[in-house]
Amino acid sequence: LSTCKTIDMELVKRKRIEAIRGQILSKLRLASPPSQGEVPPGPLPEAVLALYNSTRDRVAGESAEPEPEPEADYYAKEVTRVLMVETHNEIYDKFKQSTHSIYMFFNTSELREAVPEPVLLSRAELRLLRLKLKVEQHVELYQKYSNNSWRYLSNRLLAPSDSPEWLSFDVTGVVRQWLSRGGEIEGFRLSAHCSCDSRDNTLQVDINGFTTGRRGDLATIHGMNRPFLLLMATPLERAQHLQSSRHRR
Amino acid sequence: LSTCKTIDMELVKRKRIEAIRGQILSKLRLASPPSQGEVPPGPLPEAVLALYNSTRDRVAGESAEPEPEPEADYYAKEVTRVLMVETHNEIYDKFKQSTHSIYMFFNTSELREAVPEPVLLSRAELRLLRLKLKVEQHVELYQKYSNNSWRYLSNRLLAPSDSPEWLSFDVTGVVRQWLSRGGEIEGFRLSAHCSCDSRDNTLQVDINGFTTGRRGDLATIHGMNRPFLLLMATPLERAQHLQSSRHRR
Amino acid sequence: ALDTNYCFSSTEKNCCVRQLYIDFRKDLGWKWIHEPKGYHANFCLGPCPYIWSLDTQYSKVLALYNQHNPGASAAPCCVPQALEPLPIVYYVGRKPKVEQLSNMIVRSCKCS
Amino acid sequence: ALDTNYCFSSTEKNCCVRQLYIDFRKDLGWKWIHEPKGYHANFCLGPCPYIWSLDTQYSKVLALYNQHNPGASAAPCCVPQALEPLPIVYYVGRKPKVEQLSNMIVRSCKCS
């Protein structure tokens, strides 16, 4: 006697179709299909079709998001971190003067040591320890682009707070770019959000690693908690073992 | 004979535990647990613990995201749209002068007609039809807050494009606020992103519904495609049927 | 949501997240994971009664449909909905490694 | 991913998304939904072999674990992964309504 059970595909389809009947009615909270007695003859009104199309467009836009590759997601990611280049490095000299920004530079060779293959990087976060903040502040993060230009990345509205708190920015794309073809030193800028008509653009938030006149016994903690990049990547040897995605099973 | 099958909870747990053994090893691509022969004695190095804690913090931060309420998500949402108040309305007069912004006002009574209960709103999108754009432009969306102040909502980097394209901003929270306690007319402002040191803050992007000197035969299409709010809400009668979420089943 | 808040405090017979703590030493006999010592893995368990057919009176099942078969599956199944990762510390030779394992902790379940 | 691109073009026996088009008139006998006339609902089907036990030789199953039981379930199940909504137009009395139904279209499946 064989214990194999052949799946009756038609039966499964029929069950699914019947389940969809229930699903649609239940989603609309209808006990039975609505009466069509009063439906006006002729085509649907233009405005209704326009609204239906707007909704349909929204769906199309949503599903265009690429799905993450499950194989890549499944395997463990090695976690490393690379600390910001210390502020006494000469790179900071030409950026010291501004009241609306602070600068954070990273050594590309250290990043490449942590992640030898750019394609293996699955996530990079810029982590900053913000100290006490008396007023709400809107900040923006920029990436150093070319010579002296900066490219906007993201922003954050920081609520006032009495205690220090870690901030995290997703900078995966930028770090992958740096790993692929960055210079020797690459960097970020954290700035106050400047509205077109506002006057006071001072960066009020105090980020650990930048304040001066610090007590000696706090210096080490302060240094260790300076901004860093938290990197998650598939180890090279693990990546090489991954089967070609041609054969799923 | 009873056909009831009692679940052996212990057996299920044992199977889950064994499956986890396989899951962890397979995620690390290990055929068996790694040898511990060379592991140095004593506690883990400080730097490793700091890195572990950073990673753990990230997890904690991630899971703090509130999960959507499945019951509310399950039922169908009625879709409506409310067009922006036409630009010849007097409300626009005091906002006409700026080169870096355009203004969009909405009639709160129309919004309330579409969504009679603020809690029933599940999503609101501001939809704008952007026309051709020759240069990249970074724009910001603001909400009219009080008298003459504006609250930052979000931003978008618009790539140059030869063809018109719909832009969509999620403004659910703002519209819910307007429904709850808005004035008669509420509005948004779309502005060029002004960096703290840049000079040219002109809004280059051309949004349908604002350009002048338009041919008569295009006026209607232009009017219909002016900015609007696309609203998704649970219909009132359906909401009243929803069971209290206290009793899950 | 059929999450830890609801399921751990109820005697729900149908699909729900169930408590399960894994102690690496005791449960798996492993000494090689240095941090953490264990974790709350949890699991999903419980029936998702199939509640739709042409002869069922519609109105009776509407309220239940949402929980038992929201995806209109031909054979609904109790599976994880929200999952969280687990960071671990272990040694490869003399070198300590921190790795993050995705989708290790079950926070909530659903019928799918 | 066990998505429409992969599954519709292969003869995969294990868990995969399967094609299913619902024509509201023909399949459900409904004339009350004015738009769309039907939609690609699809469904998930296929076994998720349970492939871990103490006596299994580790190395053999590592490569398969990812597909067959990535969530380390005690009884893995083939269920939807990516779902999409469906907007519909119907009348209530003389009034046309546009409504969006969530999670109606199965785009990919997974063993969970």
Epitope: P68, E69, E71, A72, D73, T108, R112, P116, E117, P118, V119, L120, S122, L179, S180, R181, G182, G183, E184, T234, A239, L242, S244, S245, R246 | - | - | -
Partner: antibody
């Protein structure tokens, strides 16, 4: 900015050798693999091989193993490709191209090309 | 070696119309979810110019009418609205394996 400048056109007799140079500027030469590509008149592109300027490691297309030798001079940030035992079917434009960092890098910067003509 | 087969060999498209070029690999060119395919444009007498990397990423400075898509073994380069300056030969390249291999090229002309 990042630039690769190749040596000028060469006309050689069959059986001779030729050494084409590619001078890099605007980036750290030793951080990026340098690749060489052949394009025969009216034909497509063919990969010859690559070299890691930091340690001199090379990879060759099997077809060009006995034809091409890749070297670098770190002090002048210059990559070289020597072609030996020239034949008429070696007549082509040869390009150097920088690949972005890592083993799977993509070619983001190309030299202007060097035409090598083999004719008796 | 991975063989890349480009189709069609040549393509004539009216100005403002869409042009689509395909590139099929003899085996998967994906690693950890990244598709290791690049697209280049080459005009007569010039070196190739990078348009798209990792199958779908637009290189800085390249007009957004160019786009790339695909995964595993099947890839597409699309020019959404052909301009006169787009007349050229287009090549795909895989960087998944040594030796690197190019597609045979597709010549795009104006109809």
């Amino acid at each position: 900015q990042v630039q690769l400048v190749q040596s000028g056109a060469e006309v050689k007799k069959p059986g001779a050798s030729v050494k084409v140079s590619c001078k890099a500027s605007g980036y750290t030469f030793t951080s990026y693999w340098m690749h060489w590509v052949k394009q025969a008149p009216g034909q497509g592109l063919e990969w010859i091989g690559n070299i890691n300027p930091s340690n001199g490691d090379t990879n060759y297309n099997e077809k060009f193993k006995s034809k091409a030798t890749l070297t670098v001079d770190k002090s002048t940030s210059t990559a070289y490709m020597e072609l030996r035992s020239l034949r008429s079917d070696d007549t082509a434009v040869y390009y150097c191209a920088r690949a972005t960092y890592g083993s799977y890098g993509y070619f983001d910067v190309w030299g202007q090309g060097t035409l090598v003509t083999v004719s008796s | 070696d991975i063989v890349l087969t480009q189709s069609p060999d040549s393509l004539a498209v009216s100005l403002g119309e869409r042009a689509t070029i395909n590139c099929r690999a003899s085996e998967s060119v994906t690693i950890i979810g990244t598709n290791l395919i690049q697209w280049f444009q080459q005009k007569p007498g010039q070196p190739p110019k990078l348009l798209i990397y990792h199958a779908s990423n637009l290189e800085t400075g390249v007009p957004d009418r160019f786009s790339g898509s695909g995964s595993r073994t099947d890839f597409t380069l699309t020019i959404s609205s052909l301009q006169a300056e787009d007349v050229a030969v287009y090549y795909c390249l895989q960087s998944r394996q040594i030796p690197r291999t190019f597609g045979g090229g597709t010549k795009v002309e104006i109809k």
